[in-house]
Each structure stands twice: as structure tokens, then as C-alpha cells.
């Protein structure tokens, strides 16, 4: 790797941070000599910080160490001391401070219910092929085919409990066995994670915040896709989650409990029940062969209705389709039974928007996600912002600190363990694990949480979205517990093996690594992010789909080869980087490929290619439609009216002489009064909260 | 109201064939299923089988099938029933029979019946 | 096919008398049977149907009861127009039966 530039007459700083094993974070190095680092991760540089203009320190900083991009950015407080203002500039910010944290709540609050709005939206578009994977026949032979089906539908509908309660009814009706399901599970633990990480995208903004934020996102993908790496052969080869389960559920008499307690949704249930409502059993029909299903649309019409109990004759075609012999007989010509029918009235429709509509599913589908995204994405630009402006000086201090530091010695191994309890209870309380990881991914973007302290909190996540499932279990009716109840205990105890495996010995934290290795990839290639997220959620799961469904023969014919390919390359890494001396010459290093095998440059210049002709038309367009541009065609200029991406340009052509960008301040009004907007006088009326 | 007129009493000889009639008014004809029922002289009755006119489905008993062929003119309101290959024991009164009562086999209307006597 | 039998074949009795006919089918029927009446040189008539529900303008002395193999027809004040022969018959299957039938005569 190419030395790290540092200016000409600087002397190194002392002081060197790192970043501790458990996740111990540096003390806050002083004001005044604060430093940045650039956005561009190949070569990172020493900054040169603009001081806020009533300072009257030079420009030139003496550098610090060789920064790492791992460690947290200290959010610098430019505003006036709380002791050192008047009355009413104190009211002032006392008020802004309210104001701050209402708007803060109020865009959390749309935040989660554009999750939950995306969520409808993907199942307005996929659900019902997502229903369609469940009828395969062949999941019940094949866990390979399992594990994707349960992926690909997660995917499709947003939402494990939805994936998982489907689940349930097909093993409660018999068309599914405990043991073919766990595979489905798994694959709904790994398809659940992709919503943190399309909200990790829209952080793309800015390279060190997004390289922590989609870091902090995959850590959630890698941990469980390793878990399933590992345990899906072990279930297999075992059945231990099975028989476990089986074991708990055969000791225990359970009794019909309460349902599990929507905290969340009461909040969030009155908006988004006005945008839209789903009959969701549609899919759950579809995936149980139901033909009148596959013609029915998601989009709930009818709010309230009657449902009426009564019985009809019908013809049957002999007496053996009678429904007891006593309730058989004949007019002469056809033979006659009674069934017992409900008659369902219509009596209020729903208050939504798409009510009257009458469009496809498809239509109110494309229409919600692109909305919600878009939403979504407002809202965490703007969560961040604020965030940004708040959690500044002490109080960031004092809440990286907080969240940050371990316990004392000896107890510093317990911190990791409490934070997993927290993610858990975190994760119940608001009764999803999308929403609590959605909401933790901008704060280890802007740098309150460290990727080692999110990796337990992610953990517990896991943890809090099973014991939610073992309560519905237990609400659910007499013939479905023994079977729901079951499923909710594999879930669980898929997690806690994932987490025996990946957490307690720090070694075995490969997620983090793994993770830290893509989200430095993805902040230097930023379109390698939403590849990531095809080939890993969609292309990857596709491809075994299909492979599974020509044959054992032809799944083990190119998987073999595939699999047997990326050990090679692995084992061949390995002994690269721990003793090369083993190998030849020629084997010591990638060089022996040609660059696009082993490189991402020339693959980034033909995304640039690919994309350029994106770049001048989304010229005047929104922030948030900006910020999609820059993911894809990772190109600064292609947004110049909008703002959001020539800062990066800026940054990114201004590297000999490393100033901050106008966007970057961490205060709104400096960067204003650097670009020449507001007088210097008016920075006094910025306020923090400490 | 109902009524169900039948055709006059028939004298055929052993091996030949008799076709009865019975022309119904006072209801649409294609409506409800049609039954024909033997009485023997001092024996029980037996069902032969029922036509529904709408569609001309029919069903048989099998004692009778290949022998009786029932048939329904909806032009006419008239339904026909044919007995072929006759013999002694086939002397007997046959009645036509509606069933109003929909989806029973419980007849209610019937007609006067028409008397075939099988005599060489 | 399903056989019902009639007890008894005749029976001779007195004006205001309970008269009780019983049918027996060879299988469960359920209760789709239905009662006859049949006067000399007439066409049947529909007294009862679903084992109990009276034809419309049959009198209320008539009533049926049973279900599943044993049924019953019950006059319960015999008067001199309820001399007839009465038949019970079974639509459960195909082909319909009919019982033998009970003669009912005034002493």
C-alpha cells in the first residue's frame, strides 16, 4: 500500500488512537487540532481544518497521525458556550433545542412508517410470487432450496414474520414438515436484513459516513449468512434444532396466551393504515395452493364485514363426496349434500388512499415503494442532519462514551453481553428487528456507535425479533401453537448457535471484519454496494432457485466446481498473507490474472461508462433523487444545482491542500458563512444542546 | 294449477315396445325433474328414473336401463317415456311425477298413470 | 339398492284412533324420507317429506319422525277420508325406493 502523504515541515502527533478489540474508543483529541479525513479512501490525507471565522488560529493544522477511517469522527461544537450567553440567547436555544428534538421525533416517526409503507410495497409487487415459491413441491426434499426460497421471499415481501407466518400455516396444514421448514427460516433471517441495507444506501452522501454505515448494515448480512454457512450442514447432518425444539415443546403445556403486545405499531398504525392496508392472507393462500387466491389483490377494500355461518345444498358428483352419509341425497338426477358455508357481507370499506383506485397490485405497488424510498430516504438525510447538529461536543462525548466504553476490568467481556440484551429488548419493545437496525445504521453512520459496539446490538436484534415470534406462537390458535411454537424456537435457537459461534471468542467476529472489508470497498466503489445487494439477495438465491429446481444433479454439478473454486482462492489468500514463502513465485501475489479478475478499477470505469449518460440528467433534481444518482454513477458532478454531490468534488479535487468542504462543517452556519450566505456576526445564534 | 295429463292405457304384445306420454301445465316444464313409477298390480312401486327437461340429463334405474328411454319435448311440454323388449311382469300402471320441492326426491304432483297390459 | 320395509301390511282400526306405521330402510338415510297416501283408483299424494315436514294442505293429525334407519308415520285421530294405503320411500340414493305399503281400514 502506497505511503500515506503528510505535509512537508508537520511533526506526527504523539498521541495514537486505536481502536481496541471491545470496541474502546479513543478520548476526543482536542478542538483545535482537530482533524478529517478526505473522502477519498485510497489515499487518505492529514486535513487541514477551516476554523470557525471568529477564531484566530492559522490555517495550516499540524497533522496527526495516519488517521484510521474506523474511527469515530468527533462532531466539533462551533457554538457559543451555554455560560457565556445572555437570557435570552439562552431561551433561544433552549427553544431550538425543543424544536430540534420534536422534528427529530417527528422524522423518526415517518421514518419507521415509510419502513413499514416499503414493506406493503413489496408485497404489493412480490408477494404473490413470493406465495408462488412456497407451492414448490421440492422444499420438502431439498434445504438448499429451503434456505433461498425463504431469502427470496423475505426479500420480496419485507418482512420475516410475514415469511414466517406462512411458514407456520403450511406446517400447520401439513403441507410442510418441521424439518423442511428450518432451512425457509434461516433464509428468512437472512432475507430481513436487507432493509437495514437499502437504508444504509442512502447514506452514500458522504464516503466515511457511508463506509460506517453500510459496514454497520452488512455486519447483520455477514453474521447471518456465516451462521447459515456453518449450521444448515450441521441441521442437516443432526436435526439438532429439531429435535431441541421438539423436546421443549413435547415438556411444556402450554396455554393459549395473549398476543404478543404491537408497541410500535400503535404509533404508527394510524398513518400508514391511511396510505395503505393489505389482506395479507393472500399470500399465505397462494403459498397453500389456493387457485382463487392467485386472482385476488392484496389491497384490503373491505374494512368491515359479516360473516355469516349457514348452510347450502350442493350438488356433489357422487354420494362418496357426500359429507356424512346422513346428509346425502338425491333429487332423482343429482346427487345432493350440505355444506356448511360462510357468507361474508361487505359492510364499510377501508379508509385508504388507494381504495377507489381499483389498480392493479402491481401499480399501487411501484407507486408505495418508489414513494416510501423516497420518504425513507428524506428522512434519514434529515435525521442526520439533525443528529449532526445535536450530538456535538459534550454531549457527544458524553454519549459515545455511553454506548462506547466497557466495563471496568474484569467485567469489559460482559459489556458486549448487555448490549445484546439491550438490541433484544430494544427490538421487542418495538416488536421488529428492521425498524431497530434501519434506525441504528445512520448513528454508526455519523459516528455515535462504533461497528464492534452495533454488531451485539445487532445480535440481540436477532435475539428480541424470536422471543416476539414465541409470543405470537403462544396467542396463536390450539391446532397451530404446537407447530408456530416450534418454528419460533428453531428461529430462536438458530440465533443464539449464530451467536455462539460469531461473538464470544473475539477471534471468531468475522462479521465485523468481513463487513469493515466491504463497507472500505463500497466507500471507495460506491456502485459495488448495490451490487453487493443484487448478487447476495437476489442473484445468488435465483441461481440456486433455478439450479434446484432442474435437479440434485445439476445443483451439485455447478455448485461443486463454484464451491470448491472459492476455497481454493480463500486457502490460496490465506497462505498469501500468513507465510507466501509455501508458495511459488508466481502464486505469492494476484498479478498472474488479468486486472478485471482481480481488481475493481477497470470494472468501475465501465460502471462509469455505463451510467454516464445518467450523469447530466439528473442535473436539477431533488437532494434525495441526488443521492440515488451518486450510488449508481459515483460521479460528484452530476448534481451541481442540488448541492449534494459537488461537495464531494470539491473535497475530492482539493486534496493537495485538504480544506474542509462548505457541507461537511459539522456547523450548519460555518459551512453557510464559508460559502459566502451568512454574515460571520450571525454564527453566534447557533446552539448546542450542552 | 299443476297438472300432468298421461297418455291412454296401452295393450302390447310380448317383445314389442310402448311409448307414454304425459303433457304437463301449470308450471315451466324445464323447471323441475320428471319421475316415472311402476305399480304392479298388487305390488309395490318401483322408480324407473327421473329427466330433467332443462338440460335433458337423465337417470335410470338399473333394473330398467337399456329398456326404458326417457325423453322431454320442451316445444310441447311433454315428456315421453319409451319401454322396449316387453314382457308379462311389465303389466303394470305407470306414473309420471314432479318433485316442486327442489333438490328432493319427494314427488308431489303425479299424474293419472296409463295402464299397459303385456298380453299375447 | 336400499330397501325399506313397512310394517304392518294392513291394519283395520277405529275413527279417532293413533295409528303408528313404521319403515325400516336397509341403510342410513339420513332423513331424507318421504310418506304417501294412496286412495283406491287415484294417484299417490305427498303427505310428508324430510322425514317430518307436512306437504301444504296436508292436516296437522299426520306427523313423521326418525332419522338413520327407522321411521315413523303417526295419524293421530284416524277419521273415515284416511282410508288409503300409505307408502314411505327413500331419496338418500339412487335409485329411489319405495316401501311396500300399509293398507289402513276402518272396522
Known amino acids: 500500500m502506497a505511503p500515506w502523504p503528510e505535509l512537508g515541515d508537520a511533526q506526527p502527533n504523539p498521541d495514537k488512537y486505536l481502536e481496541g478489540a471491545a470496541g474502546q474508543q479513543p478520548t476526543a483529541p482536542d478542538k483545535s487540532k482537530e482533524t478529517n479525513k478526505t473522502d477519498n479512501t485510497e489515499a487518505p490525507v492529514t486535513k487541514i481544518e477551516l476554523l470557525p471565522s471568529y477564531s484566530t488560529a492559522t490555517l495550516i493544522d499540524e497533522p496527526t497521525e495516519v488517521d484510521d477511517p474506523w474511527n469515530l469522527p468527533t462532531l466539533q461544537d462551533s457554538g457559543i458556550k451555554w455560560s457565556e450567553r445572555d437570557t435570552k440567547g439562552k431561551i433561544l436555544c433552549f427553544f431550538q433545542g425543543i424544536g430540534r428534538l420534536i422534528l427529530l421525533l417527528g422524522f423518526l416517526y415517518f421514518f419507521v412508517c415509510s419502513l413499514d409503507i416499503l414493506s406493503s410495497a413489496f408485497q404489493l409487487v412480490g408477494g404473490k410470487m413470493a406465495g408462488q415459491f412456497f407451492s414448490n413441491s421440492s422444499i420438502m426434499s431439498n434445504p438448499l432450496l429451503g434456505l433461498v426460497i425463504g431469502v427470496l421471499v423475505t426479500v420480496l415481501v419485507q418482512s420475516s414474520s410475514t415469511s414466517t407466518s406462512i411458514v407456520v400455516s403450511m406446517v400447520s396444514s401439513s403441507l410442510l414438515t418441521v424439518r423442511a421448514a428450518i432451512p425457509i427460516i434461516m433464509g428468512a433471517n437472512i432475507g430481513t436484513s436487507i432493509t437495514n441495507t437499502i437504508v444504509a444506501l442512502m447514506q452514500v452522501g458522504d464516503r466515511s459516513e457511508f463506509r460506517r454505515a453500510f459496514a454497520g448494515a452488512t455486519v447483520h448480512d455477514f453474521f447471518n449468512w456465516l451462521s447459515v454457512l456453518v449450521l444448515l450442514p450441521v441441521e442437516v447432518a443432526t436435526h439438532y434444532l429439531e429435535i431441541i425444539t421438539q423436546l421443549i415443546v413435547e415438556s411444556f403445556h402450554f396455554k393459549n396466551g395473549e398476543d404478543a403486545p404491537d408497541l410500535l405499531k400503535v404509533i404508527t398504525k394510524p398513518f400508514t393504515k391511511l396510505i395503505v392496508q393489505l389482506d395479507k392472507k393472500v399470500i399465505s393462500q397462494i403459498a397453500m395452493n389456493d387457485e382463487k387466491a392467485k386472482n385476488k389483490s392484496l389491497v384490503k377494500i373491505w374494512c368491515k364485514t359479516f360473516t355469516n355461518k349457514t348452510q347450502i345444498n350442493v350438488t356433489v358428483p357422487s354420494t362418496a363426496n357426500c359429507t356424512s352419509p346422513s346428509l346425502c341425497w338425491t333429487d332423482g338426477i343429482q346427487n345432493w349434500t350440505m355444506k356448511n358455508v360462510t357468507y361474508k357481507e361487505n359492510i364499510a370499506k377501508c379508509q385508504h388512499i388507494f381504495v377507489n383506485f381499483h389498480l392493479p397490485d402491481l401499480a399501487v405497488g411501484t407507486i408505495l415503494l418508489i414513494l416510501s424510498l423516497l420518504v425513507l430516504c428524506g428522512c434519514l438525510i434529515m435525521i442526520v442532519k439533525i443528529l449532526g447538529s445535536v450530538l456535538k461536543g459534550q454531549v457527544a462525548t458524553v454519549i459515545k462514551k455511553t454506548i462506547n466504553t466497557d466495563f471496568p476490568f474484569p467485567f469489559a467481556w460482559l459489556t458486549g453481553y448487555l448490549a445484546i440484551l439491550v438490541g433484544a429488548g430494544m427490538t421487542f419493545i418495538v416488536q421488529s428487528s428492521s425498524v431497530f437496525t434501519s434506525a441504528l445504521t445512520p448513528l454508526i453512520g455519523i459516528g455515535v456507535i462504533t461497528i464492534e459496539r452495533a454488531y451485539p446490538l445487532t445480535l440481540g436484534s436477532n435475539i428480541g425479533t424470536t422471543t416476539t415470534a414465541i409470543l405470537a406462537a403462544l396467542a396463536s390458535p390450539g391446532n397451530a401453537l404446537r407447530s408456530s411454537l416450534q418454528i419460533a424456537l428453531c428461529h430462536f435457537f438458530f440465533n443464539i448457535s449464530g451467536i455462539l459461534l460469531w461473538y464470544p471468542i473475539p477471534f471468531t467476529r468475522l462479521p465485523i471484519r468481513m463487513a469493515k472489508g466491504l463497507g472500505n470497498i463500497s466507500a471507495k466503489y460506491r456502485w459495488f454496494a448495490v451490487f453487493y445487494l443484487i448478487i447476495f439477495f437476489f442473484l445468488i438465491p435465483l441461481t440456486v432457485f433455478g439450479l434446484s429446481l432442474a435437479g440434485w444433479r445439476v445443483l451439485v454439478g455447478v455448485g461443486v466446481p463454484v464451491v470448491f473454486i472459492i476455497i481454493l482462492v480463500l486457502c490460496l489468500r490465506l497462505l498469501q498473507s500468513r507465510c507466501p514463502r509455501v508458495l511459488p513465485k508466481k502464486l505469492q501475489n494476484w498479478n498472474f490474472l488479468p486486472l478485471w479478475m482481480r481488481s475493481l478499477k477497470p470494472w468501475d470505469a465501465v460502471v462509469s461508462k455505463f451510467t454516464g449518460c445518467f450523469q447530466m440528467r439528473c442535473c436539477c433534481c431533488c437532494r434525495v433523487c441526488c443521492r440515488a444518482c451518486c450510488l449508481l454513477c459515483d460521479c460528484p458532478k452530476c448534481c451541481r444545482c442540488s448541492k449534494c454531490c459537488e461537495d464531494l468534488e470539491e473535497a475530492q479535487e482539493g486534496q493537495d491542500v485538504p480544506v474542509k468542504a462548505p457541507e461537511t462543517f459539522d456547523n450548519i452556519t460555518i459551512s453557510r458563512e464559508a460559502q459566502g450566505e451568512v454574515p460571520a456576526s450571525d454564527s453566534k445564534t447557533e446552539c448546542t444542546a450542552l | 294449477q299443476v297438472q300432468l295429463q298421461q297418455s291412454g292405457a296401452e295393450v302390447v304384445k310380448p317383445g314389442a315396445s310402448v311409448k307414454m306420454s304425459c303433457k304437463t301445465s301449470g308450471y315451466t316444464f324445464i323447471t323441475y325433474n320428471m319421475h316415472w313409477v311402476k305399480q304392479a298390480p298388487g305390488q309395490g312401486r318401483e322408480w324407473i328414473g327421473a329427466i330433467y327437461p332443462g338440460s335433458g340429463d337423465t337417470s335410470y334405474n338399473q333394473k330398467f336401463k337399456g329398456r326404458a328411454t326417457l325423453t322431454a319435448d320442451k316445444s310441447t311440454s311433454t315428456a315421453y317415456m319409451e319401454l322396449s323388449s316387453l314382457r308379462s311382469e311389465d303389466t303394470a300402471v305407470y306414473y309420471c311425477?314432479?318433485?316442486?320441492?327442489?333438490?328432493?326426491?319427494?314427488?308431489?304432483?303425479w299424474g293419472q298413470g296409463t295402464s299397459v297390459t303385456v298380453s299375447s | 339398492d336400499i330397501q325399506m320395509t313397512q310394517s304392518p301390511s294392513s291394519l283395520s282400526t277405529s275413527v279417532g284412533d293413533r295409528v303408528t306405521i313404521t319403515c325400516k330402510a336397509s341403510?342410513?338415510?339420513?332423513?331424507?324420507v318421504a310418506w304417501y297416501q294412496q286412495k283406491p283408483g287415484q294417484s299417490p299424494k305427498l303427505l310428508i317429506y324430510w322425514t317430518s315436514t307436512r306437504h301444504t294442505g296436508v292436516p296437522d293429525r299426520f306427523s313423521g319422525s326418525g332419522s338413520g334407519t327407522d321411521f315413523t308415520l303417526i295419524i293421530r285421530s284416524l277419521q273415515p277420508e284416511d282410508v288409503a294405503t300409505y307408502f314411505c320411500q327413500q331419496y338418500s340414493r339412487i335409485p329411489l325406493t319405495f316401501g311396500g305399503g300399509t293398507k289402513v281400514e276402518i272396522k
Open positions: 341403510q342410513d338415510v339420513g332423513t331424507a
Open positions: 311425477s314432479i318433485s316442486t320441492i327442489i333438490t328432493t326426491g319427494a314427488v308431489d304432483y
